[in-house]
Amino acid sequence: NKILVKQSPMLVAYDNAVNLSCKYSYNLFSREFRASLHKGLDSAVEVCVVYGNYSQQLQVYSKTGFNCDGKLGNESVTFYLQNLYVNQTDIYFCKIEVMYPPPYLDNEKSNGTIIHVKGKHLCPSPLFPGPSKP
């Protein structure tokens, strides 16, 4: 028995930040779970982890240097990624694992979300023109 996950097909990070919502066919209320976000077609990089427990505050961390936060809904986890770089444009997959109560449950692999990180274009400000030639 597998949990189904829905994600947006594509998101654009204009300001080097993005909210990626992972929606599950499972209610996480009063469950112990590990929600994670993985980068790349092979999911090789674990970007962020949200650990939830019925008796503790939500814990969010990244072992791979990403700046991330997480928010919990009844049937969703939203990952908020900041300070993304253009070269981190890639496909990102949501994963959910329910550790308690038994039995252990995880998800069918989702279609993923392509996160396109747009670089900040620094335009010269008209208020501070460069030195003009006489």
């Epitope: 112990e32 427990n53 072992k63 550790m99 995880d106």
Partner: antibody, heavy 120, light 107 residues
Framework: QVQLVQSGAEVKKPGASVKVSCKAS????????IHWVRQCPGQGLEWIGC????????NYNEKFKDRATLTVDTSISTAYMELSRLRSDDTAVYFC?????????????WGQGTTVTVSS | DIQMTQSPSSLSASVGDRVTITCHAS??????LNWYQQKPGKAPKLLIY???NLHTGVPSRFSGSGSGTDFTLTISSLQPEDFATYYC?????????FGGGTKVEIK
Amino acid sequence: QVQLVQSGAEVKKPGASVKVSCKASGYTFTSYYIHWVRQCPGQGLEWIGCIYPGNVNTNYNEKFKDRATLTVDTSISTAYMELSRLRSDDTAVYFCTRSHYGLDWNFDVWGQGTTVTVSS
Amino acid sequence: DIQMTQSPSSLSASVGDRVTITCHASQNIYVWLNWYQQKPGKAPKLLIYKASNLHTGVPSRFSGSGSGTDFTLTISSLQPEDFATYYCQQGQTYPYTFGGGTKVEIK
């Protein structure tokens, strides 16, 4: 209280196999990895591998991948480490320990250790 | 694999001394560094996790610092029960690896 209790000392001949058990109590078995770490006489600590009882997924140190087999029996909250084709340099104390599956970075509870002696 | 290098490998100190042990990782492990104490014939005990967090029940004379590749374990005032071997361990990526250990002996 939280405990990991290991099986007793073993003496084996080179080429044989050994199977060490680690019985967990006092916590939810499926919330934690079980890791195996060994310590050769007078040496440091060496990570062998780990198993997650929830889905029985394993991670192995490449050095032990061909000879170590990690298993669990969730019905009795017990983990096992079998090491085959034993050599004299496998003589060591073998520890089981745990790390949290959701917050996996340190080993907070350890078994008492099992001494395995390989000698002809 | 990430290599963990501890120094010194041994040191002699007196009760009341301030003792510092260092651990160097071969690549950036951010804060995913733990410290353990081991006494002869016993299993290791967790002292510090995530570089600077004191494990439950560990005396406050133990402290940890560092991030990236360089980490330090400090015992502010060495007590008789602190004579032991100390190990660092990286928990950033598998395979998890340990430093070679630092034996703290009585001067």
